[in-house]
Interface confidence: medium
């Protein structure tokens, strides 16, 4: 079957990285610079993607595969395809149409991307606030006030909240 197909269509023999050149009697010609063909039997090569500006090249274009881009420092990818780069903000901020803005009181963002989210409401779980929230960090919930009252069963108090990577004082 493959032989029959090649007799009917000589282009089917052209491998990835080449194209079937109608101007040269359907000879398989290599893709020109800055172009590629990812499958065999193609009659043209596709133009390579250009990673410019907010993009930088993560993978160079080859004769058989397109370039892949990611974002320059200060920007991060949006979406699985990284078709858009969005400006980073500081922790404690979110990106709005007018640029990076501090999180409103009662909200936080612990990343350089995304939106400010409300602090956890400890009382919904019957707990109390052990460590107050900030613009950069959520509140830390502790045992419920009842657990700490006299006569309650003994509870080992939690260790003081600390940043990861810091040794206890």
């Amino acid at each position: 079957f493959e032989r029959t197909r090649s007799l009917q269509d000589p282009c089917s023999n052209c491998p990835a990285g080449t194209f079937c050149d109608n101007n040269r009697n359907q000879i398989c010609s290599p893709c020109p610079p800055n172009s590629f063909s990812s499958a065999g039997g193609q009659r043209t090569c596709d133009i390579c993607r250009q990673c410019k500006g907010v993009f930088r090249t993560r993978k160079e274009c080859s004769s058989t595969s397109n370039a892949e881009c990611d974002c320059t420092p200060g920007f991060h990818c949006l979406g699985a395809g990284c078709s858009m780069c969005e400006q980073d903000c500081k922790q404690g901020q979110e990106l709005t149409k007018k640029g990076c803005k501090d999180c409103c009181f009662g909200t936080f963002n612990d990343q350089k991307r995304g939106i400010c989210r409300p602090w956890t409401n400890c009382s919904l779980d019957g707990k109390s606030v052990l460590v107050n929230g900030t613009k950069e960090r959520d509140v830390v919930c502790g045992p419920s006030p009842a657990d700490l009252s006299p006569g309650a069963s003994s509870v080992t108090p939690p260790a003081p909240a600390r940043e990861p990577g810091h040794s206890p004082q």
């Epitope: 250009q50 410019k52 500006g53 907010v54 395809g81 078709s83 858009m84």
Partner: antibody
Framework: QVQLQQSGAELVRPGSSVKISCKAS????????MNWVKQRPGQGLEWIGQ????????NYNGKFKGKATLTADKSSSTAYMQLSSLTSEDSAVYFC??????????WGQGTTLTVSS | QIVLTQSPTIMSASPGEKVTMTCSAS?????IYWYQQKPGSSPRLLIY???NLASGVPVRFSGSGSGTSYSLTISRMEAEDAATYYC?????????FGGGTKLEIK
């Protein structure tokens, strides 16, 4: 915020040329691609091409090579599209749209071009 | 070039109804964008990279798919969703759009 302001409607004679502008504001013009898209009355969208203002590099849809010429002026943050040898087939609304790899959601309001004798 | 075929070309839905439209590519693409356009307005980006909601787009919109088959779903139709919807691929030059699906309200 990001805004793309296009030039006004044009009524031109067949065979002539026209240059449409797209003034960008609210972002660093030179580091984002600018795309141009055609929409004929009651029809779909057609990608014409794109220009990277930082160095003037262009990619065209083969269908519009020789018809459209894309340029950009970094000093005024303005992208231009010149259309030549105009015919009634070129009558359409033309949009500029900021792009990165795809078009990222910021579009001009459109410029209506009417080619008529 | 990659040809994108949208179906149906025209459809209507009642408020609250679930709506699904499809976009079929002539050869495999990695990601699809979806736009909404109302008469006299510029297209509005709804979905990027197949399934990511653009800023300010209601969560009733969602996108899915891979390879040559993609879809846009509106979980509960609202009157303001009456518009024409276009898919677009940016993987391979030239960028191409589908012919559009016109969604009307019943």
């Amino acid at each position: 915020q990001v805004q793309l302001q296009q030039s006004g409607a044009e009524l031109v004679r067949p065979g002539s040329s026209v240059k449409i502008s797209c003034k960008a504001s609210g972002y660093a013009f030179s580091i984002y691609w600018m795309n141009w898209v055609k929409q004929r009355p009651g029809q779909g969208l057609e990608w014409i091409g794109q220009i990277y203002p930082g160095d003037g590099y262009t990619n065209y849809n083969g269908k519009f090579k020789g018809k459209a010429t894309l340029t950009a002026d970094k000093s005024s943050s303005t992208a231009y599209m010149q259309l030549s040898s105009l015919t009634s087939e070129d009558s359409a609304v033309y949009f500029c749209a900021r792009g990165q790899l795809g078009l990222d959601g910021y579009w001009g309001q459109g410029t209506t071009l009417t080619v008529s004798s | 070039q990659i040809v994108l075929t949208q179906s149906p070309t025209i459809m209507s839905a009642s408020p609250g109804e679930k709506v699904t439209m499809t976009c079929s590519a002539s050869s495999s693409v990695s990601y699809i964008y979806w736009y909404q356009q109302k008469p006299g307005s510029s297209p509005r980006l709804l979905i990027y990279d197949t399934s990511n909601l653009a800023s300010g787009v209601p969560v009733r919109f969602s996108g899915s798919g891979s390879g040559t088959s993609y879809s846009l779903t509106i979980s509960r139709m609202e009157a303001e969703d009456a518009a024409t919807y276009y898919c677009q691929q940016w993987n391979i030059y030239p960028y191409t759009f589908g012919g559009g699906t016109k969604l009307e309200i019943k």
